[in-house]
Structure formats: C-alpha cells, structure tokens
Interface confidence: low
C-alpha cells in the first residue's frame, strides 16, 4: 500500500493510473466504501463523503489514463485509506495528515520556552526533528520543547516529521523578543554628556508596553528608579523621572536616554526592563557607566575611576609621549610632585584605551589647567 504524507491546511494529490491511456470510468472511495468522486463520461461526479466540497480531480489528465484525487485544505481527520477503482482494479493509498503548531504565540520573550505540538492521526507513530535558525537540532515525539530561547533562535524553524520512511517538512517562523545586547558599558570623563541606547532586536508593527530604568550607583547603598515610561505604538512617553540626575528620554524608538553630565555619584549599573502588552515576562538590558576624573591637589596628581570595571583593566598616569609613570589594576592612581606638562590618565583593556582624560600640570608657581 502506498503511503502519502500531507500537511494540515495544504493540498494533496493522490495518483491513480490506468493501463489504458484514455478516459475510462473510475471511482475514488474511502475505507468505509463511501464514494468521494468519480466520473460519468467527461463529467465529474461527487459522492456523499465529508470531503465533498474539498475533493477534486484533474479532468485534463483523464485522457492520459490518470485519475487523481485532489484534497484541498487538508484536515487531520482526512487521514484514511483511499481506494481508486479503475479497470476492475483497486489502487489503495494511505494518506496521513500531520499538523505542527506552536502552542503559544510565535512571538516569545528571550528566555521563555517554545513548545511545538504535532497533530497526528490515530495509530501513527511519527518522530519529529526541528532545526533552529542557528542550526540546533531538537528531536521529539508529539511535543517538542525548547527552553531558554535565545536571540539567535529568531527566524524560520524547519521541522521534519518522519513516518513510514516518508517525511514531510514544516516551517514555523518564530520571533524572539529581546534587546540587541544583553549588556553594554559606557565610559565617560567627568562632566561629559552620556547617551544610553536600548535597541530592540525585532520589529513589529505596533509595540505597546511600559518600562523602567533602575539604577544602582556604586556609591549608593540601594538602587533607585531613575525613570518610568510608557510605550504606545512605538511612541515613548515619560511617566516619572528622578530629579537627580535630570534624565531625558527620546520620544521614538530605539529607547534612548540622555544624562546631561557624567558624575562620580552616577557611576554604576542599571537595569532597563520593558514589559510588553499581552506578554508575560519582561525584556531586560543591563547598562553600566564608568566615570573618570583627573585632578591635581597641591603636589598630588590623581586619576580615579568609578563604576563597574573588571579586575583586568589598567589605570595609568603618564606624561605625554613618555612611559607611564604609574600603572595599576586599581581604581585610583597618583603621582607626587608631577613634572610640568600635559599628563594623560588612561583606562585600558589589553592595550586598548577605553577612556582618556588629560590634565595640564603647570610649573609649581601656577595653578593646574584642565582642558
């Protein structure tokens, strides 16, 4: 018996061929011997089956001795053995219809789980294998779960259903809702304007929700809410904003915040959360601010950084075009009785300068100048 696999909602064509290459009488029946369709001369006739409005044939092929049964908008319950009667012969075709659906919305938050459910006819024992856009293979039976979705899981999932050495492929488009970056770090000299950006890694026609930026300053004992906002159809409106610092927020996506001045008391890390309408859970992005200050007090030239720096970062003080006078894996360095000239304070990671502040040291009878 020939086996044909079909997909729910698709169209399938079951073939039936006579030895005579001409139009002769044929009938298609189901396993209950109920007529589905057949011919009377050059006319298509239909029986009382449930397929009535979805069954068809190709009259253009009858003259060649081909009498296909076409079933449109396939349903799982269309799975059956179909019998073609032609020339006193019976051709049997077993049709198995499968459906594969995401049992939740196909727009999922990063970290959430995706469950794909296979609808299959009774008595079948299919296996399912899905391949994610990043090439991960996931194998399962009637249900297939992927926990902790990542940004790279966005895109087309290709799922293969295997049954009786036959296979049918499904494609499901999944959108993982997330920020483009899980974390970012901004390095600024004291007094500079700070720009924080939170680009989303997906596009949807309408985006509605609410968000908040909580900030943990390095010098503070507890975190505080810096700003809360609403998002309506991609338009941003601020609800509450702290008075210190005086944050400003852009009115359009991507979410964009401006801190007028980088000051040591603001150095630290924040967590922006975004709750989207009709979604459980929130999107998160961490943002870090490192602030540098170079000062000269009497005979002491000091360079300090505040904020979340990694232990491998190097802080150096050097006279322009000279070797570093002092270089340490610490958050403050200083030089006593510095020579006159332009001094550079450098924060670097494996030789790459992340932040630089210059301070001019004048001869001892003058006061220092900070450019």
């Amino acid at each position: 018996k020939k086996v044909v696999l079909g997909k729910k909602g698709d169209t399938v064509e079951l073939t039936c061929t006579a030895s005579q290459k001409k139009s002769i009488q044929f009938h298609w029946k189901n396993s209950n011997q109920i007529k589905i369709l057949g011919n009377q001369g050059s006319f298509l006739t239909k029986g009382p089956s449930k397929l009535n409005d979805r069954a068809d044939s190709r009259r253009s092929l009858w003259d060649q001795g081909n009498f296909p049964l076409i079933i449109k908008n396939l349903k799982i319950e269309d799975s059956d053995t179909y019998i073609c009667e032609v020339e006193d012969q019976k051709e049997e075709v077993q049709l198995l219809v499968f459906g594969l659906t995401a049992n939740s919305d196909t727009h999922l938050l990063q970290g959430q789980s995706l469950t794909l459910t296979l609808e299959s006819p009774p008595g079948s024992s299919p296996s399912v294998q899905c391949r994610s856009p990043r090439g991960k293979n996931i194998q399962g039976g009637k249900t297939l779960s992927v926990s902790q979705l990542e940004l790279q899981d966005s895109g087309t999932w290709t799922c293969t259903v295997l049954q009786n050495q036959k296979k049918v492929e499904f494609k499901i488009d999944i959108v993982v809702l997330a920020f483009q970056k899980a974390s970012s770090i901004v390095y600024k000299k004291e007094g500079e304007q700070v720009e924080f950006s939170f680009p989303l890694a997906f596009t949807v026609e309408k985006l509605t929700g609410s968000g908040e930026l909580w900030w943990q300053a390095e010098r503070a004992s507890s975190s505080k809410s810096w700003i809360t906002f609403d998002l309506k159809n991609k338009e941003v409106s601020v609800k509450r904003v702290t008075q210190d610092p005086k944050l400003q927020m852009g009115k359009k996506l991507p979410l964009h915040l401006t801190l007028p001045q980088a000051l040591p008391q603001y150095a630290g890390s924040g967590n922006l959360t975004l709750a989207l309408e009709a979604k459980t859970g929130k999107l998160h992005q961490e943002v870090n601010l490192v602030v540098m200050r170079a000062t000269q007090l009497q005979k002491n030239l000091t360079c300090e950084v505040w904020g979340p720096t990694s232990p491998k970062l190097m802080l150096s003080l050097k006279l322009e075009n000279k070797e570093a006078k002092v270089s340490k894996r610490e958050k403050a360095v200083w030089v006593l009785n510095p020579e006159a000239g332009m001094w550079q304070c450098l924060l670097s990671d494996s030789g790459q300068v992340l932040l630089e502040s210059n301070i001019k040291v004048l001869p001892t009878w003058s006061t220092p100048v900070q450019p």
Epitope: S127, Q129, G135, N137, I138, T156, K167, E169, K171
Partner: antibody, heavy 120, light 111 residues
C-alpha cells in the same frame, strides 16, 4: 541507483568566480536536502553549505558566508554552488552530497568530487 | 563550533584484527537521548562513504563487522575483524550544531 555527478571545477585566479553543478539521479531530488562538503589536498573533510529540500533555507560555514551561494533547481534535478571572491584556501575537492535525516542529519550519498584550484 | 578529536591519528593493523577508533567531542552531541554522530570511510582518490549514523545505526549495505557505540561526548567505531578492503581513512562527524564538523581522520594502514 543514486548518482551525484559534479561539474564546473578547474583552475581559477584568486578573487574570481566559479560555479559548480551537481546532477542528481536515481532518487526524488525534491524530497532531499543537499549539501556541499570539501576536502583540501591532503586534509580532512569540511562541510561548506546546506540547502533544504525546496531551497527555502540555506546554511553556510562562516568562512564562505557572503561569498558562496548554494541553490537548486528541482525541475532539473541539479544542485549548484556559486563561488565568488575565491581565495587560495578554497582550493579543494568539492563533493556534492545528499543530506538524509533520521534523528540527525548526515550525508548518505556522495558524488565523486570535483577539484577547484585557486591560484595565480 | 563543536570540535571533534579522533584517536589515534593513524594505526597499523593486520587482517583479522579487531580495531577501535575513538572520537571525542568538545561538547555533548546528544539531543533527547539521540547521539548525532556519524562515521565515514574514505579510500584514496574516492569519495567518503557513510558507515554509521546516529552513533550506532549501520548504514545500508555496510558489513556487520562495523559497529558504532558511545554517547554524549565519547564515541567509538569498531571493526571486529579487519578485511583487506577496510584499510582506509575514517572520519567521525557531528550534526548537532551548525557548522557540521568532522574529526581530523584516522588512517588505518596494513601492518
């Protein structure tokens, strides 16, 4: 009998292009994913690219992304690999393979291979 | 990328010997109790030939003296009694993740 026959290889200068073809027979071509695997002279095997049964999805190894394009013509039972901006390190025997799937994907039939030499 | 390391890189054996080749993956190649590991045989100037798929399944037409075992990160190809036609290079290959990767190969020579 499954047969995969590659053609289109040869000597090409760095930076130039070449198009490999693979004529398939002995099986229903449109039911199978296909892939290209290469082997540099005296070296091991290296997967290059894969295309799904209907051509809608393609995968590439990082070193060829943006330079190579895998495609297929199911009406002609033919697989292609368009190779642009060729480099000396692309010199290899290129095998056309059929990609079968049980629980994993694997290469169950291979062509005889075609040599691509990139040299000035 | 998942790295596959085969050992030994080469070995000499005689007809009738039992031979074992191992393949170690840098991370697990298992999904839902399926081990996505294959073994191929390649003779000089010829295309590779599939021997074993999914760690232990024998490919069509492959003699039963070939067998595969292992799970997770450690896999083995065993030839129970070497035949003259078995002298070749053997490769393991994972298909858990893109890019598909192969081991560096094990050359089996006549002693």
């Amino acid at each position: 009998e499954v047969q995969l026959v590659e053609s289109g290889g040869g000597l090409v200068q760095p930076g130039r292009s070449l198009r490999l073809s693979c004529a398939a027979s002995g099986f229903t071509f449109s039911n199978y994913g296909m892939a290209w695997v290469r082997q540099a002279p005296g070296k091991g095997l290296e997967w290059v690219a894969t295309i799904s049964y209907d051509g809608s999805i393609t995968y590439y190894r990082d070193s060829v992304k943006g330079r190579f394009t895998i495609s297929r013509d199911n009406s002609k039972n033919t697989l292609y690999l368009q190779m642009n901006s060729l480099r000396a390190e692309d010199t290899a025997v290129y095998y056309c393979t059929r990609e079968e799937q049980y629980s994993s994907w694997y290469f169950d039939f291979w062509g005889q291979g075609i040599l691509v030499t990139v040299s000035s | 990328d998942i790295q596959l390391t085969q050992s030994p890189s080469s070995l000499s054996a005689s007809v009738g010997d039992r031979v074992t080749i191992t393949c170690r993956a840098s991370q697990s190649v298992s999904i839902s109790s399926h081990d996505l590991m294959q073994w191929y045989q390649q003779k000089p100037g010829k295309a590779p030939k599939l021997l074993i798929y999914d760690a232990f399944n024998l490919a069509s037409g492959v003699p039963s003296r070939f067998s595969g075992s292992g799970s997770g990160t450690d896999f083995t190809l065993t030839i129970s009694s070497l035949q003259p036609e078995d002298f070749a290079t053997y490769y393991c290959q994972q298909s858990k993740d893109d890019p598909y990767t192969f081991g560096q190969g094990t050359k089996l020579e006549i002693k």
